[in-house]
């Protein structure tokens, strides 16, 4: 079948999800496409515990997550509600800064060197994290 009951090689399992941590950089859209090619998505952070887990693995390096406001409001790539969900922005962020001189504002969110979030130009080649959930069917206890 197509059920994913365990994490692929080189992925890290944590709380019924699998995570893969890149060691190179891509623009946000290319990182998003890469994760989708792996039947996954850019990481969606839903709790302080998950934040600490990801932060531990990426270290002090700018790293894309699956959060953007390219179409207006901030949205998580898997549909998780942004307004009611976990947030960990740096002070004064997001600021949609236009002063970088690259054209436009800042529409994609990343982990900064201290783990807190910042919005930045989506074309910057940052590292990224993919996440995929283990199948719900596989989480049910076996019938006796």
């Amino acid at each position: 079948g197509s059920e994913r009951t365990c994490c692929p090689v080189n992925w890290v399992e944590h709380e019924r999800s699998c995570y893969w941590f890149s060691r190179s950089g891509k623009a946000w859209a290319d990182a998003d496409n890469y994760c989708r090619l792996e039947d996954a998505h850019l990481v969606v952070v839903t709790s302080w515990e998950e934040q600490k887990f990801v932060q531990h693995h990426i270290g002090p390096v700018n790293t894309w997550m699956g959060l953007h406001d390219q179409n207006g409001p901030w949205k998580w790539v898997d549909g998780t509600d942004y307004e009611t969900g976990f947030k960990n922005w740096r002070p004064e962020q997001p600021d949609d800064w236009y002063g970088h001189g690259l054209g436009g504002g800042e529409d994609c969110a990343h982990f900064t060197d201290d783990g807190r979030w910042n919005d930045d130009v989506c074309q910057r080649p940052y590292r990224w994290v993919c996440e995929t959930e283990l199948d719900k069917a596989s989480q049910e206890p076996p019938l006796l």
Epitope: R4, V9, N33, R36, E38
Partner: antibody
Framework: EVQVLESGGGLVQPGGSLRLSCAAS????????MSWVRQAPGKGLEWVSA????????YYADAVKGRFTISRDNSKNTLYLQMNSLRAEDTAVYYC????????????????WGQGTLVTVSS | DIQMTQSPSSLSASVGDRVTITCRAS??????LGWYQQKPGKAPKRLIY???SLQSGVPSRFSGSGSGTEFTLTISSLQPEDFATYYC?????????FGGGTKVEIK
């Protein structure tokens, strides 16, 4: 040994349809994204389409978007390319190819190719 | 789309020569680049992946270098079986794009 074998090519009239197949063996098919690449007679290589291992995501070159559909049947270890509204410029040898993962788990495209199947679009 | 400009489009060389082929990307692609060899009527064969990693089973006279926008394939000592067409491929961004090819012919 990794093997991919294309089939389904042939002569078709402009506006017609054709479905290519690629039978894979020697690796865990569902764990790998797969691609189609084509080569017009006497020309260079052109990437056509890609699909994720479980089929959840697909990607297309602009030249074929809306006309070609990539799919896979992991129970049969087979990749497909459904080609509709064919044009003379689609005439090419079509190759099926898989990628590989490096030691960090990063995917690199196109390490094993089939021998190709020729599609000729002509009236 | 990322354009891959490959040069030269053709070259003539002798057995034992050192041959260098270049690919230039229209924007940075990190090291998401492979090099392929194709002989007439045959499927392409990957020689190099990740810009500089040698594919298993490929002779060590083939090497790749570069990162970002400039990449090079070098054949340190050309052998008779190396006369073929060579292509680069970038996979940093969709659509994937190939260079136009370099035909290596016998002088």
């Amino acid at each position: 040994e990794v093997q991919v074998l294309e089939s389904g090519g042939g002569l078709v009239q402009p506006g017609g349809s054709l479905r290519l197949s690629c039978a894979a063996s020697g690796f865990t098919f569902s764990s790998y994204a797969m691609s189609w690449v084509r080569q017009a007679p006497g020309k260079g290589l052109e990437w056509v389409s890609a699909i994720s291992g479980r089929g959840g995501s697909t990607y297309y070159a602009d030249a074929v978007k809306g006309r070609f559909t990539i799919s896979r049947d992991n129970s049969k270890n087979t990749l497909y390319l459904q080609m509709n509204s064919l044009r003379a410029e689609d005439t090419a040898v079509y190759y099926c190819a898989k990628g590989s993962y490096d030691s960090s788990g990063y995917y690199h495209y196109l390490d094993h190719w089939g021998q190709g199947t020729l599609v000729t679009v002509s009236s | 789309d990322i354009q891959m400009t490959q040069s030269p489009s053709s070259l003539s060389a002798s057995v034992g020569d050192r041959v260098t082929i270049t690919c230039r990307a229209s924007q940075g692609i990190e090291n998401d680049l492979g090099w392929y060899q194709q002989k007439p009527g045959k499927a392409p064969k990957r020689l190099i992946y990740a810009a500089s990693s040698l594919q298993s089973g490929v002779p060590s006279r083939f090497s790749g270098s570069g990162s970002g926008t400039e990449f090079t394939l070098t054949i340190s000592s050309l052998q008779p079986e190396d006369f073929a067409t060579y292509y680069c491929l970038q996979h940093n961004s969709y659509p994937l794009t190939f260079g136009g090819g370099t035909k290596v012919e016998i002088k």
